[in-house]
């Protein structure tokens, strides 16, 4: 029977910058029942406080509701590990919330085929961003992915849509369902989880030469352009 | 609606002991620091103790270290405080109250007089 | 300790004045100050906190201001309900303190 080895916060995420979870992971309990708790401090104060909430992040975890996370302070926090034998400190993490932000996935996703008379037929997507986030306020910049891949295929292909809330893409295989998914991530933080995939049968009919694709919009100042392969690898690593 | 009511409270002797019972409704008890707060007949208010949500971090003021003892039950939803050693300065109505640790302290008892008198 | 020094300890006024308390800290306490109103028999209600911001509820005529060592509580047209004892509160450091209180009586 020994103390509890050295706890580790090692994950801290938020939603929206406006309540914040974090997550340890034990240590070695020692071999005796073992009491975790979160302290924490907001850069420049004196005052250390324990965690509001044990319960909404599930085990091993601390959440921060609105009332406690300030965007602009530094927290500093530690988790203590205690048994009957004696207690253990993880090493203090600091956390700034404009760092630490993983919004939910984006939502709506819709995938049509468009087949205009005058023009090439493409995959014209469109989603919403996730509920949680205020993009009014001007505090967020949210940035956007897409992937797409015939149903039996084993690798995706990925485009970056920007800001957008759309895209179209014309390279396609006919004939073939392809799923379709997006992501979105903040300027300053982590990519979103993968929304739930949308199946999209594309016609038999639907004729494009594979080596050209659309790009955003957006990205070409509003105007639908053809661009090759190689000009499409130029344009996202400039 | 939050409520918090203290019971507890009476006449004992110099030395006696008293435990001071604080029972909470209307707040999720667990997510909430409390402390006890004092007031002598006539005088201003006086901190006493503060308890953390996981009682890990305990504090007194150093005219009752020693001789006070807070506690908390976060299933029963009550904050407690164990009062030994008593003396006529400890003569008080002891309220508790909910520390919003982004605030200050925003829900307060209505108090329970404690006479400390031979 | 950190002494909190409030003043006046008494203050005569009537409905419809502006009425000013002031608390000094006795060493920097940032914004960490709360203001409370407390009427005879009952417990005390939370005004302000951090030093400026408006506890919800809590009427607008009431404002706080002040950081470091002195704040200010400001009741700007004083009504009949208003009369009452009022403290502040540091909440930067261990013992927490609590001002002598001012007591706001009718002229």
């Known amino acids: 029977q020994l103390p509890p080895g050295k706890p580790e916060i090692f994950k801290c995420r938020s939603p929206n910058k406006e309540t914040f979870t974090c997550w340890w992971r034990p240590g070695t309990d020692g071999g005796l029942p073992t009491n975790y708790s979160l302290t924490y401090h907001r850069e420049g104060e004196t005052l250390m406080h324990e965690c509001p909430d044990y319960i909404t992040g599930g085990p091993n975890s601390c959440h921060f509701g609105k009332q406690y996370t300030s965007m602009w302070r530094t927290y500093i926090m530690m988790v203590n590990a205690t048994n009957q034998m004696g207690s253990s400190f993880s090493d203090e993490l600091y956390v700034d919330v404009t760092y630490i932000v993983q919004p939910d996935p984006p939502l709506e996703l819709a995938v049509e085929v468009k087949q205009p008379e005058d023009r090439k037929p493409y995959l014209w997507i469109k989603w919403s961003p996730p509920t949680l986030i205020d993009l009014k306020t001007g505090w967020f910049t949210l940035l956007y992915e897409i992937r797409l891949k015939p149903e039996k295929a084993a690798e995706w292909e990925i485009h970056f849509a920007g800001q957008q809330t759309e895209f179209k893409i014309l390279s396609l295989h006919p004939g073939q369902k392809y799923l379709v998914q997006v992501r979105c991530k903040p300027d300053h933080g982590y990519w979103s989880a993968w929304s739930p995939a949308t199946f999209i049968q594309i016609p038999s009919d639907f004729t494009m030469n594979d080596e050209q694709k659309l790009i955003s919009e957006e990205d070409l100042g509003g105007e639908q352009k053809l661009i090759s392969e190689e000009d499409l690898h130029h344009h996202h690593h400039h | 609606e939050v409520q918090l009511v203290e019971s507890g409270g009476g006449l004992v002797k110099p030395g006696g002991s008293l435990r001071l019972s604080c029972a909470a409704s209307?707040?999720?008890?667990?997510?909430?620091?409390m402390n006890w707060v004092r007031q002598a007949p006539g005088k201003g208010l006086e901190w006493v103790s503060s308890i953390s949500t996981r009682s890990s971090l305990i504090h007194y003021a150093d005219s009752v270290k020693g001789r006070f003892t807070i506690s908390r039950d976060n299933a029963k939803n009550s904050l407690y405080l164990q009062m030994n050693s008593l003396r006529d300065e400890d003569t008080a109505v002891y309220y508790c109250a909910r520390w919003d640790a982004a605030a200050a302290f925003d829900y307060w008892g209505q108090g329970t007089l404690v006479i400390v008198s031979s | 300790d950190i002494q909190l020094t409030q003043s006046p300890s008494f203050l005569s006024a009537s409905v419809g004045d502006r009425v000013t308390i002031t608390c000094w800290a006795s060493q920097g306490i940032s914004s960490y100050l709360a203001w409370y109103q407390q009427k005879p028999g009952k417990a005390p209600k939370l005004l302000i906190y951090?030093?400026?911001t408006l506890q919800s509820g809590v009427p607008s005529r009431f404002s706080g201001s002040g950081s470091g060592t002195e704040f200010t509580l400001t009741i700007s047209s004083l009504q009949p309900e208003d009369f009452a004892t009022y403290f502040c509160q540091q909440l930067n450091s261990y013992p927490l303190t609590f001002g002598g209180g001012t007591k706001v009586e009718i002229k």
């Open positions: 209307g707040i999720t008890f667990s997510s909430y620091s």
């Open positions: 951090v030093a400026s």
